[in-house]
């Protein structure tokens, strides 16, 4: 796959993942009422990160926001924080990656700058995806713990009126938002990895070495460390070339950076 295609695909995949992270964060169905014991419920409860909702058979749906911060479980606060961090990093990653795209020309930005930006955006996407996956997983773990605690309470003696009156304990299970979040986080992560791979293709691998000029007797040719390849412009062409610091590009070099095979 070409560098441009890899970078472009990574960007698109990350963008889809990022949109999914936003969608998951906003969704109300992070946890939904477990209908195993009562599949024909007339009142259906579901909860999100920001509000809890009740949908009745009548069609009436009521949602109430969590207007308190202090009264909320620390785990829920942590999940909220992780999702927001994921979104913020994703926004920055998108902005950086737009400028890093090889297919977009912005002023005199050279490939090494684009490579650095591609790597930066890739890392941001990876962290964004990880934040989302961790956030969703923490919430899922919280649900599993509460589910089994509710189940234990449900079967440990029904109190009141000598066991005659049953108290229906509402248990919650995984909501659609969790699956959206996992998939979205995974896509953002994959997109970020692809951006990092694309960065390797954009980076001149010999740019870390200083070019050294050797003055051969009888010839005034500057040599770069490396084999003689037609693609390097050496061998048949013996015109004087001024080597810049870092040896990334020659004065009249029209092509992009040497490939990673340009050194021995």
């Amino acid at each position: 796959m070409s560098v441009t295609a890899c970078q472009g695909l990574g960007f698109v995949v990350s963008l889809i993942g990022f949109a999914g992270i936003i969608a998951a964060t906003c969704m109300d169905q992070w946890s939904t009422q477990d209908l195993y014991n009562n599949p024909v419920t007339a009142v259906f409860n579901y909860q999100g990160l920001w509000r809890s909702c009740v949908r009745e058979s009548s069609g009436f749906t009521e949602c109430r926001g969590y207007f308190t911060l202090l009264g909320l479980p620390a785990m829920l606060q942590a999940v909220r924080a992780l999702m927001i961090v994921g979104i913020v990093l994703g926004v920055i990653g998108i902005l950086v990656s737009i400028f890093a795209l090889k297919c977009i020309r912005i002023g005199s930005m050279d490939d090494s700058a684009k490579a650095k930006m591609t790597l930066t955006s890739g890392i941001l996407f990876i962290i964004s995806g990880i934040c989302a996956i961790i956030g969703v997983s923490v919430f899922a773990n919280m649900l599993v713990t509460n589910f089994w605690m509710s189940t234990a309470n449900m079967y440990s003696g029904m109190g009141g009126m000598g066991g005659m009156v049953q108290t229906v304990q509402t248990r919650y299970t995984f909501g659609a938002a969790l699956f959206v979040g996992w998939v979205a986080g995974g896509l953002t992560l994959i997109g970020g990895v692809m951006m990092c791979i694309a960065c390797r293709g954009l980076t001149p691998d010999d740019s870390n070495f200083k070019a050294v000029s050797y003055h051969a007797s009888g010839q005034n040719v500057a040599y770069r460390p490396g084999g003689f390849k037609a693609s390097t412009g050496f061998g048949s062409n013996t015109r004087n070339k001024k080597i810049y610091d870092g040896g990334a590009r020659t004065e009249d070099d029209e092509q992009s950076h040497p490939t990673k095979y340009d050194y021995v």
Partner: antibody, heavy 118, light 113 residues
Framework: DVKLVESGGGLVKPGGSLKLSCAAS????????MSWVRQTPEKRLEWVAT????????YYPDSVKGRFTISRDNAKNTLYLQMSSLKSEDTAMYYC???????????WGQGTSVAVSS | DIVMTQSPSSLTVTTGEKVTMSCKSS????????????LSWYQQIPGQPPKLLFY???TRESGVPDRFTGSGSGTDFTLTISNVQAEDLAVYYC?????????FGAGTKLELR
């Protein structure tokens, strides 16, 4: 003004069938969950069936499940109750009702009488 | 199924009196999601269909006089008529709106002494 008018009741033999209709007016019929409730000669109220707004979900008590079918025609603003394999215990006044907040029934029709007797 | 038990089955009152009738459910009708009790009260005047008085146990339906009060939570509910009028003589039913099958109480008949 909300109006629910039931029709289709009558005398039927055990094992027979009957189809009740409920013509709704004065409200957006398609936006409401509808139910049928019956009142026995002993004046006991029994819920018979519920059909959710879109018509995709229907609910019945065990006493009528498999014998009664609730349906709706939103274009005609009409609710139906198809009753088959009728038993003497199905003898009652059948009311068409509209569900609102709290799953409560805010409007009831005047009812249609069904008598199952040999 | 949730069983609704109403008591007393009949009440004999004089106009102006305060009346209280009870409704008990075999399961809690309190929904943890919105902290609302899914119980409704109906009034049936002879020869007429039932009329909704309260939903969510205590939310008064529009047009219902404020002498009627619905209260209670969980499994125990009460309908109170503070100043009984002649037009209040009817049968009062409570209903479980929380889970299918929806079930009604046997009713409390309010009669004039």
């Amino acid at each position: 003004d909300v109006k629910l008018v039931e029709s289709g009741g009558g005398l039927v033999k055990p094992g027979g069938s009957l189809k009740l209709s409920c013509a709704a007016s004065g409200f957006t019929f398609s936006s409401y969950t509808m139910s049928w409730v019956r009142q026995t000669p002993e004046k006991r109220l029994e819920w018979v069936a519920t059909i959710i707004i879109g018509g995709s979900y229907t609910y019945y008590p065990d006493s009528v499940k498999g014998r009664f079918t609730i349906s709706r025609d939103n274009a005609k603003n009409t609710l139906y109750l198809q009753m088959s394999s009728l038993k003497s215990e199905d003898t009652a006044m059948y009311y068409c009702t509209r569900l609102v907040k709290g799953n409560a029934m805010d409007y009831w029709g005047q009812g249609t009488s069904v008598a199952v007797s040999s | 199924d949730i069983v609704m038990t109403q008591s007393p089955s009949s009440l004999t009152v004089t106009t102006g009196e305060k009346v209280t009738m009870s409704c008990k459910s075999s399961q809690s009708l309190l929904n943890s999601g919105n902290q609302k009790n899914y119980l409704s009260w109906y009034q049936q005047i002879p020869g007429q269909p039932p009329k909704l008085l309260f939903y969510w146990a205590s939310t008064r339906e529009s047009g219902v006089p404020d002498r009627f009060t619905g209260s209670g939570s969980g499994t125990d509910f009460t309908l109170t008529i503070s100043n009984v009028q002649a037009e209040d003589l009817a049968v009062y039913y409570c209903q479980n709106d929380y889970s299918y099958p929806f079930t009604f109480g046997a009713g409390t008949k309010l009669e004039l002494r």
